[in-house]
Amino acid sequence: LPVCGQPSRALPNLVKRIIGGRNAELGLFPWQALIVVEDTSRIPNDKWFGSGALLSESWILTAAHVLRSQRRDNTVIPVSKDHVTVYLGLHDVRDKSGAVNSSAARVVLHPDFNIQNYNHDIALVQLQEPVPLGAHVMPICLPRPEPEGPAPHMLGLVAGWGISNPNVTVDEIIISGTRTLSDVLQYVKLPVVSHAECKASYESRSGNYSVTENMFCAGYYEGGKDTCLGDSGGAFVIFDEMSQRWVAQGLVSWGGPEECGSKQVYGVYTKVSNYVDWLLEEMNSPRGVRELQVER
């Protein structure tokens, strides 16, 4: 069985802080998925992008808001599985020759996903066919099912292409890389922020912002581009010293990507450890795959 959370190429040590983004080398984030949604039921066709993380040969973990249609405002309508394409092993969007693309067999949004405050912002995509695993396509580990989540000051990595304007065809995005912040996968290093500090930072701003117990925050008080670069739904991964594996502790949810660089506006992430049981139940994983997926 292939292992999770162990890229063939060692990720950089976490002593030196990264401000802003930096190019990822091929194979650094083998779990990284590009999710392309093309809603052809609408005129004009709606089209958007997000990130996700490979959990097994057949399952992608992402944020629910990436897979929700905006056609209805107060109703959570998942996009049709027929409108979803997932790219794995993708490094440079100008060259998809080494990438694997797969259509979706199922799209599963958390039943309690709330569009007003993004509580329970987590979802799964089941791939039509299992993807072949290798040096550039490997799963990430799930955390232990516990409510605490990552501790403040722990450093994690988030990767993404920063696709910002999808008014182009998928081929243009994948082949030419137009309308992306970067052609090459970028990553940033961010510290986890205490729940109290993050809650206070959002409460100090007028509005209906709610940092729930199903979320955690990361970023720097002084702001900067590091809060913008992760595509929605991408995994916030932390290295677990005990198991020597990388673990998906969070998913890019809201906050930072909307107000990039603002002082004391932290990125808010879905706390994956609160959903491990739900994820395993949905994936209906056999015992062996559970061993593979969950950090021991």
């Epitope: 209805r72 405002d73 107060n74 007003q116």
Partner: antibody, heavy 116, light 112 residues
Framework: QIQLVQSGPELKKPGETVKISCKAS????????MSWVRQAPGKGLKWMGW????????TYADDFKGRFAFSLETSARTPYLQINNLKNEDTATYFC?????????WGQGTSVTVSS | DVLMTQTPLTLSVTIGQPASISCKSS???????????LNWLLQRPGQSPKRLIY???KLDSGVPDRFTGSGSGTDFTLKISRVEAEDLGVYYC?????????FGGGTKLEIK
């Protein structure tokens, strides 16, 4: 609290272009689409279309295809309405409203006067 | 496009008395998802519109319970049990079921 704050009144000549902004605050911006609604002087409301704030894809009602363009500056939480080649009949108040269909919160409106 | 017809055009009501506004659509507003996207808003003089009711009968937060919405298919009604001075303005219904969304012509509520 949830707020939509629009740019100030505009006085333009026929043939010119106007760009109206609608700064949103108090909610997760990319969670809701943004509609644009026109109200001619002394008249009722007419829905112009909406923009998906997550994908950036605009949808226009038939009467507003061509000279009208919706756009976004997501990092500034600001949708825009641009009207090109202004005509006298574009004189109206333009409202932004949160949601593609719900339109539950409205901006204060931007008055556009087109006169030679 | 779906035509939304509101009646009456103008409504003069004494404070404390009830009021009723009708809104009829040219086709059923029941969507394939089982919901009916019929909404009501109030535009007070010189102000921007404010939504009062969505999905036929659900009251927006802060809207007094003297307002009620009802109806189904093509016939809808907004009722005010006891009109107050702050209720004056123009009431619009609109539908969000069939593209493009369309508004009724409006009903002006005046205080006698």
């Amino acid at each position: 609290q949830i707020q939509l704050v629009q740019s100030g009144p505009e006085l333009k000549k026929p043939g010119e272009t106007v760009k109206i902004s609608c700064k949103a605050s108090g909610y997760i911006f990319t969670s809701y689409g943004m509609s644009w609604v026109r109200q001619a002087p002394g008249k009722g409301l007419k829905w112009m279309g909406w923009i998906n704030t997550y994908s950036g894809v605009p949808t226009y009602a038939d009467d507003f295809k061509g000279r009208f363009a919706f756009s976004l500056e997501t990092s500034a939480r600001t949708p825009y309405l641009q009207i090109n080649n202004l005509k006298n009949e574009d004189t109206a108040t333009y409202f932004c409203a949160r949601g593609g269909e719900a339109m539950d919160y409205w901006g204060q409106g931007t008055s556009v006067t087109v006169s030679s | 496009d779906v035509l939304m017809t509101q009646t009456p055009l103008t409504l003069s009501v004494t404070i404390g008395q009830p009021a009723s506004i009708s809104c009829k659509s040219s086709q059923s507003l029941l969507d394939s998802d089982g919901k009916t996207y019929l909404n009501w808003l109030l535009q007070r003089p010189g102000q921007s519109p404010k939504r009062l009711i969505y999905l036929v009968s659900k009251l927006d937060s802060g809207v007094p319970d003297r307002f009620t919405g009802s109806g189904s298919g093509t016939d809808f009604t907004l009722k005010i049990s006891r009109v107050e001075a702050e209720d004056l303005g123009v009431y619009y219904c609109w539908q969000g079921t069939h593209f493009p969304w369309t508004f009724g012509g409006g009903t002006k509520l005046e205080i006698k």
